[in-house]
Interface confidence: medium
């Protein structure tokens, strides 16, 4: 029955840890009497047996999924309008393979497996985008910011992680970028600044690094953007699908982020933008469900230098960790975790 | 509720060509296909061709085949007749009517639009 | 394409009558038929699909029966809206309708 259709690409190719949206509709004609019966859609992997093995995505409320796959996978499209249309995020290398979708309306019951939509997951090589609006100039303050705008709102948030030898701290933090407040010295000058992110949701890692230009001479205002590469559209679908991003205010002074440190002599002072819950009868809040940071530090720091920082997101809890770099934790001191929440 | 709203009548000369159109106002025709029927003054219903909007796939009777094109607008949920080489003997009027089933059974209909041709 | 026949052409009945018309088809046509209920001026209405299945709000007066080439549609006891004419459609094979058969009050 020439009725008996499904339109969709050949293939897709995403990047690894990015995102994708596959348009596709079908159209198999149903009984009448089943005309107000639900519609129900689902993408198998290829070889699946319907009765026995789980969807990647399905709009049936009661149907279990394939765990790899689970709130990765998306049928985005409504069946109910002939739309099959597949959501992907967070791709990763296991989701290479063909794909077939299966409609079900009452007692019609079809598996388009003559048309197959094909997925190629490649290698990440897009990279993060730094931004330094103006002139640094020594013992300036400036706005850092690194960016990664082809990533898309719908996948798990990425993590920021900045490494400068240069005195630092945090600024705001999006879902596609992260500011780095730098206040240069001019022996920073030529030093290495790097952006580092990474997609948790398939653990992969890009980066930039670039190196600190600190002149005297005051000169013209310019912005200095250093672009990621590989941002050829050879037949790659890139990401940023519609949909809603978390956006969170971090400010953190590394030089008084709250931190507790056990030692036999002293604790270290305690200062955070945002709120803070150590519960102090208790220690720090600790739950299976947050994860924690350490703070690797030694007792007091008399300087913000030398420090590396990461920013993680989530969907409620937000993480700062400093790596003081050259410095050993005292032989007595153990460390305690703290959270940072943001209001 | 979903209503097929056609277009206006129409006079046509001879040798001419007419296009009507068919709107789903108040829903889609995603899932159906949409045909088009003619019926002759004092005659009977005679079935013209059809479109199934989401596949763009149109087919039409052996007796319309070259003269009819039937397309549609998935955006605006719009179909279109149109009829070329226009006789006397294609005054009729024109309906379109939903199809609502794996038989074709036309379950919502519009009101008809009258094509009058003549010199 | 499959032709269908209607009969009567046109029928006379009075009010509370039982009335019932024919279609036959030029071939087999399992249970793909319908019929419509059309009044001058208006479109056709749809009231019975596959054969003998009533569209919701058709009232139960009207009853369809038949698979194969034979097929009738029986209105047990007609009110006066019920004088219309009435097509069969088959859609085995492309689309026909019948000739019509003309309901008039006696």
């Known amino acids: 029955d020439p009725r008996v259709r499904l339109e969709v690409q050949e293939s897709v190719t995403v990047q690894e840890g990015l995102c994708v949206l596959v348009p596709c509709t079908f159209f198999h004609p149903v009984p009448y009497h089943t005309r107000n019966s639900p519609v129900h859609g689902y993408w198998f992997r290829e070889g699946a047996i319907v009765s026995l093995d789980s969807p990647v995505a399905t709009n049936k409320l009661d149907q279990e999924v394939r765990e790899e796959t689970q709130g990765r996978f998306r049928l985005l499209g409504d069946p109910s309008r002939n739309n099959c249309s597949l959501s992907i995020v967070d791709a990763r290398r296991r989701d290479n393979g063909s794909y077939f979708f299966r409609m079900e309306k009452g007692s019609t019951k079809y598996s388009y497996k003559s048309t197959q939509l094909s997925v190629h997951v490649t290698d990440l090589t897009h990279r993060p985008q730094i931004l330094i609006p103006g002139a640094l100039d020594p013992d300036h303050s400036k706005n850092l910011t690194c960016s990664v705008p082809w990533a898309c709102e719908q996948g798990t948030p990425p993590i920021f992680s900045w490494m400068s030898a240069a005195p630092t701290s945090l600024g705001l933090r999006t879902t596609h970028s992260s500011v780095l407040i730098i206040t240069p010295r001019p022996q920073d000058h030529g030093t290495n600044l790097t952006c580092q992110v990474k997609f948790p949701g398939a653990g992969v890692t890009t980066e930039r690094t670039i190196q600190l230009n600190v002149s005297y001479a005051s000169q013209n205002p310019r912005t200095d953007i250093f672009l990621g590469d590989g941002s050829g559209k050879q037949g790659v679908v890139q990401g940023a699908i519609g949909g809603a991003g978390v956006t969170v205010l971090l400010a953190l002074c590394l030089c008084l982020i709250f931190f507790t440190v056990k030692t036999h002599r002293r604790k270290a002072a305690r200062t955070a933008v945002g709120r803070i819950d150590t519960h102090p009868a208790t220690g720090p809040t600790s739950s299976k469900h947050q994860k924690k940071s350490k703070l690797h530090g030694a007792t007091e720091t008399s300087g913000c230098s030398g420090t590396t920082l990461t920013v993680e997101m989530d969907e409620e809890l937000h993480y700062a960790s400093l790596n003081f770099h050259g410095m050993n934790p005292s032989e007595d001191t153990s460390t305690e975790y703290s959270e940072v929440r943001t209001q | 509720q979903v209503e097929l709203v056609q277009s206006g009548a129409e006079v046509k000369k001879p040798g001419s060509s007419v296009k009507v159109s068919c709107k789903a106002s108040?829903?889609?025709?995603?899932?159906?296909?949409i045909s088009w029927v003619r019926q002759a003054p004092g005659q009977g219903l005679e079935w013209m061709g059809r479109?199934?909007?989401?596949?763009?796939?149109?087919n039409y009777a052996q007796k319309f085949q070259g003269r009819v094109t039937i397309t549609a607008d998935k955006s605006t949920y719009t179909a279109y007749m149109e009829l070329s080489s226009l006789r006397s003997e294609d005054t009729a009027v024109y309906y379109c009517?939903?199809?609502?089933?794996?038989?074709?059974?036309?379950?919502?209909w519009g009101r008809g639009t009258l094509v009058t041709v003549s010199s | 394409d499959i032709q269908l026949t209607q009969s009567p052409s046109s029928l006379s009945a009075s009010v509370g009558d039982r009335v019932t018309i024919t279609c036959r088809a030029s071939q087999g046509i399992s249970s793909a038929l319908a019929w419509y209920q059309q009044k001058p001026g208006k479109a056709p209405k749809f009231m019975i699909y596959d054969a003998s299945s009533l569209e919701s709000g058709v009232p139960s007066r009207f009853s369809g029966s038949g698979s194969g080439t034979d097929f009738t549609l029986t209105i047990s006891s007609l009110q006066p809206e019920d004088f219309a004419t009435y097509y069969c459609q088959q859609f085995n094979s492309s689309i026909t309708f019948g000739q019509g058969t003309k309901l008039e009050i006696k």
């Open positions: 009517a939903r199809e609502g089933g794996v038989d074709w059974y036309f379950d919502l």
């Open positions: 108040g829903g889609t025709f995603s899932s159906y296909a």
């Open positions: 479109i199934i909007p989401i596949l763009d796939m149109a």
